[in-house]
Amino acid sequence: LEDCAQEQMRLRAQVRLLETRVKQQQVKIKQLLQENEVQFLDKGDENTVIDLGSKRQYADCSEIFNDGYKLSGFYKIKPLQSPAEFSVYCDMSDGGGWTVIQRRSDGSENFNRGWKDYENGFGNFVQKHGEYWLGNKNLHFLTTQEDYTLKIDLADFEKNSRYAQYKNFKVGDEKNFYELNIGEYSGTAGDSLAGNFHPEVQWWASHQRMKFSTWDRDHDNYEGNCAEEDQSGWWFNRCHSANLNGVYYSGPYTAKTDNGIVWYTWHGWWYSLKSVVMKIRPNDFIPNVI
């Protein structure tokens, strides 16, 4: 009887080992099929819209990455509360799984838009370097379904790059005017969003817990209208130390107000950045290494 029990245990262990091996093979086969499929989809041109069909529904780009799709491009996602799916650029570099929520690259898109446009999103959702704003509604759906880290990649016209990263990036809903909430900062560009660079200016320069404003919907803390003066939609205070939706100028600029693409702690108020990418990924993202 003891021999029989031991033999049972041995066979169980063998079955478990075989199950593990089969699972590993299945994963490998799946990855190879996906690589093949993605290579077929990638025409290598500027248009990077990747259609995965309705095989499964993804809530963000980290899920797509962890399902084996390693090619950057536009994919369809449907966050938890979202009534419908929408297109978004997935950055599968820099560790992978980043959902790009905003991009500035060349000034081709007008970012001086009203509340509805910023709510629903606008821009170029086809080309790799296309400029866009994903939409406040979509930002809310995304950032309330999980705890996300916001990474902001910044570049100037002198070929320098910096980044700023914030834990627990959250955007409220339409009823609280898409209020911004950010957590702990890390990075090389300086903390322009929370305004921690100088305690004396924090009361008017911080964007933390600010409501979103556009020229036609003013929720800032300023007697005037920040969005109108700065010609963009943003989480304005009185008015800003960061404004990544500002007017596209080529580096240093002069204007009536500091309305360029500004990250104060790197280039001050009177330098407009060359490119910006705002992207999010779950705080505890672990890539599925196959």
Epitope: S54, R56, Q57, A59, N168, K170, D173, N176, N181, P282
Partner: antibody, heavy 116, light 107 residues
Framework: EVQLQQSGPELVKPGASVKISCKAS????????INWVKQKPGQGLEWIGW????????DHNEKFKDKATLTVDTSSSTAYMQLSSLTSEDTAVYFC?????????WGQGTLVTVSA | DIVMTQSQKFMSTSVGDRVSITCKAS??????VAWYQQKPGQSPKLLIY???NRYTGVPDRFTGSGSGTDFTLTISNMQSEDLADYFC?????????FGAGTKLELK
């Protein structure tokens, strides 16, 4: 540590109303949706609705539209559900739930018994 | 609304068994499915999310599989502490919907 602490059991008469509470701790209350779920004795689970504490915005399962009213008190990080015009069909355990893509935190449940 | 059907209300098992609990969605839900374990007088405990991902602290004898409309929760080496009700849930779209549950009992 995320915790949802619900109020104690309730014995109520048919036709009356009851308000049950769910006190959140261990996280920023206003940043996450709170869902409410019903479980009749020995049965499955039914989603009642959600509330977004950041704004008080709500959405309901059509079935519970006239039955459940969801509110929050952000100063005490507490979500409330009021059930009205109670009948024996409302006898159940009611759970509050913070549901994300990769986690789910449930309250311990509140038993509501409707009896004359 | 999406209906989640757990066809087996009860399942008889023995310690050491391999148990498979199935759940069928009335329409494609991708992999937006979670599995819960519930013991009498307790709230449900999350076992599996995204159809196949094990939640933190869940023993590796629990595995989830499936996509689209057909889902399975497998317990590879049944333990006495696994005797409980098991529910599937879809979160592909609101309203969130749950299966009626499958109760595991000892033979």
């Amino acid at each position: 540590e995320v915790q949802l602490q619900q109020s104690g059991p309730e014995l109520v008469k048919p036709g009356a109303s009851v308000k049950i509470s769910c006190k959140a701790s261990g996280y920023t209350f206003t940043d996450y949706y709170i869902n409410w779920v019903k479980q009749k004795p020995g049965q499955g689970l039914e989603w009642i609705g959600w509330i977004y504490p950041g704004s008080g915005n709500t959405d309901h399962n059509e079935k519970f539209k006239d039955k459940a009213t969801l509110t929050v008190d952000t100063s005490s990080s507490t979500a409330y559900m009021q059930l009205s015009s109670l009948t024996s069909e409302d006898t159940a355990v009611y759970f509050c739930l913070r549901f994300l893509l990769r986690s789910a935190y449930w309250g311990q449940g509140t038993l509501v018994t409707v009896s004359a | 609304d999406i209906v989640m059907t757990q066809s087996q209300k009860f399942m008889s098992t023995s310690v050491g068994d391999r148990v498979s609990i199935t759940c069928k969605a009335s329409q494609n839900v991708g992999t937006a499915v979670a599995w819960y374990q519930q013991k009498p007088g307790q709230s449900p405990k999350l076992l599996i999310y995204s159809a196949s991902n094990r939640y933190t602290g869940v023993p590796d004898r629990f595995t989830g599989s499936g996509s689209g409309t057909d889902f399975t929760l497998t317990i590879s080496n049944m333990q006495s502490e696994d005797l409980a009700d098991y529910f599937c849930q879809q979160y592909s779209s609101y309203p969130l919907t749950f299966g009626a549950g499958t109760k595991l009992e000892l033979k």
